[in-house]
């Protein structure tokens, strides 16, 4: 049978930026860094100043979803983390401004942010069973679980 793709008609409206300039560390104490113009990867850094700093923007769902829906932007840029398919790298998409409304295929820009203690998970809104993940010797990607690492610690500067 032909593959079936369901695109929800839920609309997500931008509310505000809720976190600025934070770092994502995975469970192996690796930080997310820029691999190139398009991809991210993870490495245990000698100097954390080399890690990517992210901003997090919150969106409100027309469905009144209880989940926190967010967009991830590299701080001081116009680059946004964008989901592809399972085991595919997340991409950095350049946009002139943060989208005020997101729906349909554009939901690949959005993630459900869940926290369990100090562990943070980012599930793709477009692919609700897949998480932002790190994988050994690979880009930051979308994955369903092990062997990829799907839990992150958010490091906010405590200066």
């Amino acid at each position: 049978s032909a593959p079936f793709s369901f695109l929800s008609n839920v609309k997500y409206n931008f509310m505000r930026i809720i976190k600025y300039e934070f770092i994502l560390n995975d469970a192996l104490n690796q930080s997310i860094i820029r691999a190139n113009d398009q991809y991210l990867t993870a490495a245990a850094l000698h100097n954390l100043d080399e890690a990517v700093k992210f901003d997090m923007g919150a969106y409100k769902s027309s469905k009144d979803d209880a989940k926190i829906t967010v967009i991830l932007r590299i701080s001081k840029t116009q680059l946004y983390v964008t989901a592809q398919d399972e085991d595919q790298p997340v991409l950095l998409k350049e946009m002139p401004e943060i989208p005020k409304t997101i729906t349909g295929s554009e939901t690949n820009l959005l993630f459900f942010w869940e926290t369990h203690g100090t562990k943070n998970y980012f599930t793709s809104v477009a692919h609700p069973n897949l998480f932002i993940a790190t994988k050994q010797d690979y880009w930051v990607c979308l994955a369903g679980g092990p062997p990829s690492i799907t839990d992150f610690q958010i490091l906010e500067n405590q200066a």
Partner: nanobody
Framework: EVQLLESGGGLVQPGGSLRLSCAAS????????MVWVRQAPGKGLEWVSS????????YYADSVKGRFTISRDNSKNTLYLQMNSLRAEDTAVYYC?????????????????WGQGTLVTVSS
């Protein structure tokens, strides 16, 4: 040869302050995260705080957050820990260390170099 030399420990009353220093040599100081760890009498090593190579990012254990401040002067190759509102449970030998890799040492951290430590005793 890499060397880390801590100083500034001593006896202080509860609520008091101390400033620890760590003089580093033998490596390019500003290219590395640095951390403070401590070992209380009869206990294991506890991570206290980390600072990035350029000093742009700092992070603290919950037990010291709001009371301790980590900083560094890369022109002097020196790491600092300002300790305020000291409590009896802060009594420990404090070590500065250079992590082998990574930043937050609460779960995953190994050190390639650390100092000989400086004793901080908080008691009335």
């Amino acid at each position: 040869e890499v060397q880390l030399l801590e100083s500034g420990g001593g006896l202080v009353q509860p609520g008091g302050s101390l400033r620890l220093s760590c003089a580093a040599s033998g490596f390019t100081f500003n290219e590395y995260n640095m951390v403070w760890v401590r070992q209380a009498p009869g206990k294991g090593l506890e991570w206290v705080s980390s600072i990035s190579g350029g000093g742009g990012f700092t992070y603290y254990a919950d037990s010291v957050k709001g009371r301790f401040t980590i900083s560094r002067d890369n022109s002097k190759n020196t790491l600092y820990l300002q300790m305020n509102s000291l409590r009896a449970e802060d009594t420990a030998v404090y070590y500065c260390a250079k992590p082998l890799r990574g930043f937050v040492c609460s779960q995953h951290c190994s050190f390639d170099y650390w100092g000989q430590g400086t004793l901080v005793t908080v008691s009335s």
